[in-house]
Amino acid sequence: ATKLTEEKYELKEGQTLDVKCDYTLEKFASSQKAWQIIRDGEMPKTLACTERPSKNSHPVQVGRIILEDYHDHGLLRVRMVNLQVEDSGLYQCVIYQPPKEPHMLFDRIRLVVTKGFSGTPGSNENSTQNVYKIPPTTTKALCPLYTSPRTVTQAPPKSTADVSTPDSEINLTNVTDIIRVPVFN
């Protein structure tokens, strides 16, 4: 079996997680793609997905999660803005390919969000500021409900720093005039 690897991101509340998942261009360019969270003993939960068929570079936003699929370069960009401690957890990008099981894109993302003033740059941070001038619009994309049961058994144990995301959808509120410090992956 393929050994699943994780990439760890340690960020502070209010920052932006920005990761890139790459895929085989020719095979998956217009396939629907999704961002999932993996919780112990459960099937991965889809938090956001691209449209079907996926549109080139056009952002799809669900709450605080923004997906951008760059077809020509085989790249799915995932951003989670205004991070909260509760967002900590294990995430993955997948490609939906019905009737087959979703295809997982490596690596999985181990996100650890800690409390703290995000205006002070740390080891994984920078001082470039981002201004949200208007509340972003939300585009709801219809995501298939199925996920591979096999993925559950592959999930590594949670780290002690891990805090599960609540079952409620991740929502973005009160973003007007808030200063954020982005961390682009």
Partner: antibody, heavy 117, light 107 residues
Framework: EVQLVESGGGLVQPGGSLRLSCAAS????????MSWVRQAPGKGLEWVAN????????YYVDSVKGRFTISRDNAKNSLYLQMNSLRAEDTAVYYC??????????WGQGTLVTVSS | DIQMTQSPSSVSASVGDRVTITCRAS??????LAWYQQKPGRAPKLLIY???RLQSGVPSRFSGSGSGTDFTLTISSLRPEDFATYYC?????????FGQGTKVEIK
């Protein structure tokens, strides 16, 4: 065919202001992050600023923060860079570029900004 | 910010030569590195993205490799139109940063 055409460059005195424009065509402008990248005479490339598809997020390099403002008008397929309190070290060719996830895939021809007294 | 160091700063070569340019990142950037070619008075042109993927329309004599901190651009057989300055760009850490450039000159 993707095209980016910059305009608005010129000679300006230190402390002065200038507004650069970039006219985009050949692609769905409103679907892409856009950037300004500059190159001082005989020097290398430096990313200056970028802006999200809907204009709701802006990012700047530290050296221009508080002085430059990036904006866009999706109805006009146009990108702008308002440059205030200009300094001699801002002298450069300014390029408009399309962000494509992990690279700048298309660039304009550039417009020269000279800050000198 | 992530610093990108290119070497050499210039290289003299002849048509038909194999030319190798390296770029080193001050910290790991996975595979998120692009290479550009720039000729005098012209805008940069994207050659390679994601460390090794060839941009559409770019000749196959250009190739890229590497991941983490060390990356290489190779021109397998130099052509007259390849004499130019080459830049690397990292897109892993924000802000995106360029290398200082490598000028490929005629020997």
């Amino acid at each position: 065919e993707v095209q980016l055409v910059e305009s608005g460059g010129g000679l300006v005195q230190p402390g002065g202001s200038l507004r650069l424009s970039c006219a985009a065509s050949g692609f769905t402008f409103s679907s892409y992050w856009m950037s300004w990248v500059r190159q001082a005479p005989g020097k290398g490339l430096e990313w200056v600023a970028n802006i999200k598809q809907d204009g709701s997020e802006e990012y700047y390099v530290d050296s221009v923060k508080g002085r430059f403002t990036i904006s866009r008008d999706n109805a006009k397929n146009s990108l702008y860079l308002q440059m205030n309190s200009l300094r001699a070290e801002d002298t450069a060719v300014y390029y408009c570029a399309r962000d494509y996830g992990e690279s700048f895939d298309y660039w304009g021809q550039g417009t020269l900004v000279t800050v000198s007294s | 910010d992530i610093q990108m160091t290119q070497s050499p700063s210039s290289v003299s070569a002849s048509v038909g030569d194999r030319v190798t340019i390296t770029c080193r990142a001050s910290q790991g950037i996975r595979k998120w590195l692009a290479w550009y070619q720039q000729k005098p008075g012209r805008a940069p042109k994207l050659l390679i993205y994601a460390a090794s993927r060839l941009q559409s329309g770019v000749p196959s004599r250009f190739s890229g490799s590497g991941s983490g901190t060390d990356f290489t651009l190779t021109i397998s057989s130099l052509r007259p139109e390849d004499f130019a300055t080459y830049y690397c760009l990292q897109a892993h850490g924000f802000p995106w940063t360029f290398g200082q450039g490598t000028k490929v000159e005629i020997k």
